[in-house]
Interface confidence: medium
């Protein structure tokens, strides 16, 4: 899941950070505690994040995140989720990891 280098990327990352920050700070249990595959974000980027979150349905709280990730993932065809073997985590924990990854990317590039 390479990250597209474009003028709008920093703005999109900032939008994602804001959305993820909203989610992580809201104290309501996210997606009723649903579990997702833990993925290697450093290796797969936003595409694997999107793949992992695609398995969550009927959760309005992450729709906007999914939409932003869709825009950040610039591959043509779906790939298999690069998961850490048999590791599932709560979607809230996943979102926290995604937020850390996105902040790191926003601070240090590449774009």
């Amino acid at each position: 899941g390479p990250v597209p280098r474009s003028v709008s990327l920093p703005l999109t990352l900032k939008e994602l950070i804001e959305e993820l920050s909203n989610i992580t700070q809201d104290q309501t249990p996210l997606c009723n505690g649903s579990m997702v595959w833990s993925v290697d974000l450093a290796a797969g980027g936003f595409c694997v994040a999107l793949d992992s979150l695609t398995n969550i349905s009927n959760c309005n709280a992450i729709y906007r995140t999914q939409r932003i990730l869709h825009g950040l993932c610039n591959r043509k065809a779906p790939t298999t989720v690069s998961s850490l073997p048999d590791t599932k985590i709560e979607v809230a924990h996943f979102i926290t990891k995604l937020l850390s990854y996105t902040k790191q990317l926003f601070r240090h590039g590449p774009f």
Partner: antibody
């Protein structure tokens, strides 16, 4: 270490306003939501509101809509509570408390508290 | 709103076991957890988180504190009770907003 330090006690007359501050240190302020909790003398704890420290957006309990304003001075890592048109029943100790889902915290629980600010409303 | 009910007072002897209960008006469970937390408040002090998500002991809290329960019925156990455990204990649900606390149980010496 994580610290939440609140402003000092206040003695006010009915109809006046009060502003209470809660200064955070020892962690990244904008990574954690901040809650406010009221405790009337000899009574239990009552949740008032939480504020998103990244966006500044507060979410209120029904009983605390109207005269209560929850805000931030994020650059100073400070959350504030302002109560206008004070009433006798506002006499209480007000606590700020940190909470959030960030890794390393206790999911959904208030894991660090300020020392409390006593507000007395009396004519 | 989820209402949490606690007994107002529990009298206990030093060295004995104290069992403090909290009953919720509806389930505080999600698929993977029961979202009930326990706080201690000594007189004149701020509350302190003891146990989160029903049974997880906060780092630095003595092992004589433990939590159990599921659904709507929860328990905080202190065994054995020591003198500095004399305080009020509050349960709090994290299942839905508005977040609510129990009325508190004051631990007193017999």
């Amino acid at each position: 270490q994580i610290q939440l330090v609140q402003s000092g006690p206040e003695l006010k007359k009915p109809g006046e306003s009060v502003k209470i501050s809660c200064k955070a240190s020892g962690y990244t302020f904008t990574d954690y939501a901040m809650h406010w909790v009221k405790q009337a003398p000899g009574k239990g704890l009552k949740w008032m509101a939480w504020i998103n420290t990244y966006t500044g957006k507060p979410t209120y309990a029904d009983d605390f809509k109207g005269r209560f304003v929850f805000s931030l001075e994020a650059s100073a890592s400070t959350a504030t509570l302002q109560i206008s048109n004070l009433k006798n029943e506002d006499t209480a100790t007000y606590f700020c408390a940190r909470a959030g889902r960030t890794e390393g915290t206790h999911y959904y629980a208030m894991d660090a508290w300020g020392q409390g600010t006593s507000v007395t409303v009396s004519s | 709103d989820i209402v949490l009910t606690q007994s107002p007072v529990l009298a206990v002897s030093l060295g004995q076991r104290a069992t403090i209960s909290c009953r919720a008006s509806q389930s505080v469970s999600i698929s993977s957890s029961d979202l009930m937390h326990w706080y201690q408040q000594r007189p004149g002090h701020q509350p302190k988180l003891l146990i989160y998500r029903t049974s997880n002991l906060v780092s630095g809290i003595p092992a004589r504190f433990s939590g159990s329960g599921s659904g709507t019925d929860f328990t905080l156990t202190i065994d054995p009770v020591q003198a500095d455990d004399i305080a009020a204990y509050y349960c709090q649900q994290g299942r839905e907003s508005p977040w609510t606390f129990g009325g508190g149980t004051k631990l007193e010496l017999k």
